[in-house]
């Protein structure tokens, strides 16, 4: 029987470092090895018939035990499939190796209205583009961490909001007078230093009533 395997199905490595993605195989008399890269809608061939393809040949080397990168960038994050087949035969096996290139978060950008109407919906956003793996977001009001569920903490029990740590979106619905304050957010991805945005003050104002 044939086997294709990697003892490291997930590899995490800081950006600009060398890395090896392992692929061990047995039971093939004339193995033909291919490596495919997948990330979202992108699919690229890294290695074809035991040879690194032109787009990778300057920075990737084929070894009998895997492929080795001289230096990885954030764009290399994705799933690599090692596919081994018998030359001119039916035997086939494959193994997937997930590569996560670690990049610390950058300073998040916030979109916070300077004023918003009480009783209406107010949307605050926080995002940063560099972090790999993607950052999770924590919101602060007047320097105090906002819990995911406002009812869980006395300080926020009068607020009505939904906080999404993955997207960084904070939605007040409805906004109340007590939501006035200085808001900032923090991005962290478990690698490098968590980064904090600028603080922006939001005023919850009464609805203008026409005479």
């Amino acid at each position: 029987s044939v086997t294709v395997h990697s003892s490291e199905p997930e590899v995490r490595i800081p950006e600009n470092n060398p890395v090896k993605l392992s692929c061990a195989y047995s039971g093939f008399s004339s193995p033909r090895v291919e490596w495919k890269f997948d990330q979202g809608d992108t699919t690229r061939l890294v290695c074809y018939n035991n040879k690194i393809t032109a787009s990778y040949e300057d920075r990737v080397t084929f070894l009998p035990t895997g492929i080795t990168f001289k230096s990885v960038t954030r764009e290399d994050t994705g799933t690599y499939t090692c596919m081994v087949s018998e030359e001119g035969g039916n035997s086939y096996g494959e193994v997937k190796v997930k590569l996560i290139v670690l990049v610390p978060p950058s300073k998040p950008t916030v979109n916070i209205p300077s004023s918003a109407t009480i009783g209406n919906r107010a949307v605050l956003t926080c995002s940063e583009q560099d972090g790999s793996p993607p950052s999770e977001y924590t919101w602060f009001k007047d320097g105090i961490v906002m819990p995911t569920n406002p009812k869980s903490t006395r300080a926020f029990s009068n607020s009505s909001y939904v906080l999404n740590p993955t997207t960084g979106e904070l939605v007040f619905d409805p906004l109340s007078a007590s939501d006035t304050g200085e808001y900032s957010c923090e991005a962290r991805n478990g690698y490098g230093t968590p980064m904090t945005s600028n603080a922006v003050r939001m005023e919850a104002v009464e609805r203008n009533v026409g005479v």
């Epitope: 490595i13 890395v19 090896k20 392992s22 035990t65």
Partner: antibody
Framework: EIQLQQSGPELVKPGASVKVSCKAS????????MYWVKQSHGKSLEWIGY????????RYNQKFKGKATLTVDKSSSTAFMHLNSLTSEDSAVYYC?????????WGQGTTLTVSS | DIQMTQSPSSLSASLGGKVTITCKAS??????IAWYQHKPGKGPRLLIH???TLQAGIPSRFSGSGSGRDYSFSISNLEPEDIGTYYC????????FGGGTKLEIK
């Protein structure tokens, strides 16, 4: 014949550092990752980390990060493990091992004794 | 991390007899288990990989079996040179050794 020949026993004082070597022969040194394994007295084996001799890439078991540093000299087909800030907890036999998927060839071991 | 529980920790058997050692993984390891013989002053010697595949040059007195989380290793027709400590290794996801079994010949 594939062989991994390790350096001899070491007796060092607490706080010092040591460098253990592992010379490979009988195969293409850069084709296989080189692993280091620790065996404390009366205990089982645990992997410390590995180095890919082709490009110098390393991975460490979380437990040994900051304790061990792995390097290679391709010209002499030799792998090295540097252990720093030694304490009695580091007294053990250290092995180098070649990895395919499992560890197929091992060095004879280097005994490290940390004592004042 | 995957844990490997090896038993027994020691055993004694007669020349010509048979012994069996077991390793239980904390999760399914998909047959990716190897067995080693270890003697003092030497490095471990690979006997079996992928549950039951004998390494080149290893006599057929050594055998392995199992699946899922449960694996066993046997030596039949015991010989004096079989004394030593035996370890299992899971290599399905990273690498974890069992605690070892010390074999003595009566």
């Amino acid at each position: 014949e594939i062989q991994l020949q390790q350096s001899g026993p070491e007796l060092v004082k607490p706080g010092a550092s040591v460098k253990v070597s592992c010379k490979a022969s009988g195969y293409s040194f850069t084709d296989y990752s080189m692993y280091w394994v620790k065996q404390s007295h009366g205990k089982s084996l645990e992997w410390i980390g590995y180095i890919d001799p082709y490009n110098g890439g390393t991975r460490y078991n979380q437990k040994f990060k900051g304790k061990a540093t792995l390097t290679v000299d391709k010209s002499s087909s030799t792998a090295f493990m540097h252990l720093n800030s030694l304490t009695s907890e580091d007294s053990a036999v250290y092995y180098c091992a070649r990895q395919t998927d499992y560890f197929d060839y091992w060095g004879q071991g280097t005994t490290l004794t940390v004592s004042s | 991390d995957i844990q490997m529980t090896q038993s027994p920790s020691s055993l004694s058997a007669s020349l010509g007899g048979k012994v069996t050692i077991t390793c239980k993984a904390s999760q399914d390891i998909n047959n990716y288990i190897a067995w080693y013989q270890h003697k003092p002053g030497k490095g471990p010697r690979l006997l079996i990989h992928y549950t039951s595949t004998l390494q080149a040059g290893i006599p057929s007195r050594f055998s392995g079996s199992g699946s899922g989380r449960d694996y066993s290793f046997s030596i039949s027709n015991l010989e004096p040179e079989d004394i030593g400590t035996y370890y299992c290794l899971q290599y399905d996801n990273l690498w974890t050794f069992g605690g070892g079994t010390k074999l003595e010949i009566k």
